[in-house]
């Protein structure tokens, strides 16, 4: 339905807090060096306008798009050049095009100062001195380090993040109260970063028809009693909402989604169980929770997928009738009987049936050709079972830590012209798989593990994409999106590496280790060993993990010294000697 | 200087047990890596197990992960190999090796070596 003034409609469908909070995070999003306060000017600016636009959709302007209002005030800031660069140009550019130019000089990685958290009664004294502008600068500043993040699931961590405040400031032990609520919220604010980020790249690197298979799978895994045409109308729907969150448009995005969780709710009878508690939450909850519901239990007594799909004789005809609905049919039958499978290995299925169907079905005798495909599937289902079951054992033997530190070293020597900051984080992130995951019992490792890793796995492939140094991620990034992570596994060591120059100050520690916390620590240690490999590719296993703890009882000897900056200083030199010696540096 | 003896050597059947010792003179035992290395006649001596100076982290040849246990008591001054499942191949002269770094230790270039002790599994 064509509104006068689009503007108008969004202000009035979102409410003014919703709408104001969504512009912050659209042009904190854009624009990721601008200072807070231009930031909320503008949006003032903005807000003041959609208001006349509201009192009359026919004033001046108000019939402008989106991204033209949206456009034309970004381009207003006076140091866009200088801050930005060449981002500056696409002021230059009509819509749709300026859009499309700030979206491509989104930063994954911005040079932003860490975000450092201040003492809980100086948080507590700006929480209540001016609850808005500190709610307001908690949306910048996620959304300007995050500038995928799920817009208007950010505006549900800013609701939890007020209600902790509200709560501890007013606790006995402060502190106590807020800090395990900033950390929960810190952590599962990073996932949901990196979940969206992958929706976004799913989208704009391998396009809609890539991004609805995906959905198809987990939408059918998660609502099995749901009928097809069920399922393939909220594919759709959440393929729209994404498609403009990615896009920059996140008003709509905002209100389509509220309209998704509103028809959920409304048809959930013909859609899962499971949705009762989430619907009867206010609409933030209410759709953080549907996004997050359990899989419903499956239809008792479901048939054979071989009669549909291998057996009956029209499989060409339906097939050549409408292929993308009969492989999304497929795709929804095979992903409703397996919640056991992870997404990317039911796409991968779909993969092959779709080849095998392309095959065969030009074949002399089609039948026969097709007949055996479920076969083909049993070595793709094997694959990510064995590997994560050797992975789990690993994790179990190892412990966190160590796990991160073997992985760290596997993908070091499989790719070590990345960054050394990009691979202790990427394997950092790689290892948390095992806590996350081993845990569960085995129906639900796979679709924990493997869709988990899929999330990581496209933090190095952005990443990496900002500043391209090896093909071989480049290769494994762009060929297949299903197939990415079975690309990355199967990398051996790269034998055309050049061992980087040894620098003795890469190796050289100081007394502010030992004030550090325990994450921080390991971080240090991380990039220690990612450095020793990339100057040391053939070293063993074993020379690294003695090397570490060469390096860990250093650090301890060092922390309890009462000189620890000499101790640091001639430790230091002597155990990179004992190094350079045994390994040859 | 650092003294290291080993004993518990002798001949096994297959499938059984033994329990390596090596004892060391000197009063900074504790912040020495110790490690196991053995010799097969006409072979190359190789790396079978170690044990850090913190918090016991221990490493193992992987021939050898999961049948082996090294141990350290620093009271005691001796550090263990206790070898479980005991196949043919494991037939060497067992050396036991110490020194400041675990680094050094596995890529066989400690400071001090004991004069080992013989194992023999037989079939």
């Known amino acids: 339905d064509a509104h006068k003034s689009e503007v108008a409609h969004r202000f009035k469908d979102l409410g003014e807090e919703n709408f104001k909070a969504l512009v912050l995070i659209a042009f904190a999003q854009y624009l990721q060096q601008c200072p807070f306060e231009d930031h909320v000017k503008l949006v003032n600016e903005v807000t003041e306008f959609a208001k006349t636009c509201v009192a009359d959709e026919s004033a001046e302007n108000c019939d402008k798009s989106l991204h033209t209002l949206f456009g034309d005030k970004l381009c207003t800031v006076a140091t866009l050049r200088e801050t930005y660069g060449e981002m500056a140009d696409c002021c230059a550019k009509q819509e749709p095009e300026r859009n499309e130019c700030f979206l491509q000089h989104k930063d994954d990685n911005p040079n932003l100062p860490r975000l450092v958290r201040p003492e809980v009664d100086v948080m507590c004294t700006a929480f209540h001195d001016n609850e808005e502008t500190f709610l307001k600068k908690y949306l910048y500043e996620i959304a300007r380090r995050h500038p995928y993040f799920y817009a208007p699931e950010l505006l549900f961590f800013a609701k939890r993040y007020k209600a902790a405040f509200t709560e501890c400031c007013q606790a006995a032990d402060k502190a106590a109260c807020l800090l395990p609520k900033l950390d929960e919220l810190r952590d599962e604010g990073k996932a949901s970063s990196a979940k969206q980020r992958l929706k976004c790249a799913s989208l704009q690197k391998f396009g809609e028809r890539a991004f609805k298979a995906w959905a198809v799978a987990r939408l059918s895994q998660r609502f099995p009693k749901a009928e097809f045409a069920e399922v393939s109308k909220l594919v759709t729907d959440l393929t729209k909402v994404h498609t403009e969150c990615c896009h920059g448009d996140l008003l709509e995005c905002a209100d389509d989604r509220a309209d998704l969780a509103k028809y959920i709710c409304e048809n959930q009878d013909s859609i899962s169980s499971k949705l009762k508690e989430c619907c009867e939450k206010p609409l933030l909850e209410k759709s953080h929770c549907i996004a997050e519901v359990e899989n419903d239990e499956m239809p008792a007594d479901l048939p054979s997928l071989a009669a549909d799909f291998v057996e009956s004789k029209d499989v060409c005809k339906n097939y050549a009738e409408a292929k993308d609905v009969f492989l999304g049919m497929f795709l929804y039958e095979y992903a409703r009987r397996h919640p056991d499978y992870s997404v990317v290995l039911l796409l991968r299925l779909a993969k092959t049936y779709e080849t095998t169907l392309e095959k065969c079905c030009a074949a002399a005798d089609p039948h026969e050709c097709y007949a055996k495909v479920f076969d083909e599937f049993k070595p793709l289902v094997e694959e990510p079972q064995n590997l994560i079951k050797q992975n789990c054992e690993l994790f179990e033997q190892l412990g966190e830590y160590k796990f991160q530190n073997a992985l760290l070293v596997r993908y070091t020597k499989k790719v070590p012209q990345v960054s050394t900051p990009t691979l202790v984080e990427v394997s950092r992130n790689l290892g948390k798989v095992g806590s996350k995951c081993c845990k569960h019992p085995e129906a639900k490792r796979m679709p924990c593990a493997e869709d988990y890793l899929s999330v990581v796995l496209n933090q190095l492939c952005v990443l990496h994409e900002k500043t391209p140094v090896s093909d071989r991620v480049t290769k494994c990034c762009t060929e297949s999106l299903v197939n990415r992570r079975p690309c990355f596994s199967a990398l051996e060591v790269d034998e055309t590496y050049v061992p980087k120059e040894f620098n003795a100050e890469t190796f050289t520690f100081h007394a502010d280790i030992c004030t550090l916390s325990e994450k921080e620590r390991q971080i240090k240690k991380q990039t220690a060993l990612v450095e020793l490999v990339k100057h040391k590719p053939k070293a063993t296993k074993e020379q690294l993990k003695a090397v570490m703890d060469d390096f860990a009882a250093f650090v301890e000897k060092c922390c309890k010294a009462d000189d620890k900056e000499t101790c640091f200083a001639e430790e230091g030199k002597k155990l990179v000697a004992a190094s350079q010696a045994a390994l040859g540096l | 200087q650092v003294q290291l003896v080993e004993s518990g050597g002798g001949l096994v059947q297959a499938g059984g047990s033994l329990r390596l010792s090596c004892a060391a003179s000197?009063?900074?035992?504790?912040?020495?890596?110790i490690g196991w290395f053995r010799q097969a006649p006409g072979k190359a001596r190789e790396f079978v197990a170690r044990?850090?100076?913190?918090?016991?982290?221990?490493d193992y040849a992987d021939s050898v992960k999961g049948r082996f246990t090294i141990s350290r008591d620093n009271a005691k001054n001796t550090v263990y190999l206790q070898m479980n499942s005991l196949k043919p191949e494991d037939t060497a002269v067992y050396y036991c090796?110490?020194?400041?770094?675990?680094?050094?230790?596995?890529?066989?270039?400690?400071?001090?070596w004991g004069e080992g002790t013989q194992v023999t599994v037989s079939s």
């Open positions: 090796a110490a020194d400041s770094y675990n680094v050094r230790l596995v890529t066989g270039e400690a400071d001090y």
């Open positions: 000197g009063r900074t035992f504790s912040s020495y890596a």
């Open positions: 044990v850090s100076t913190i918090a016991g982290d221990t």
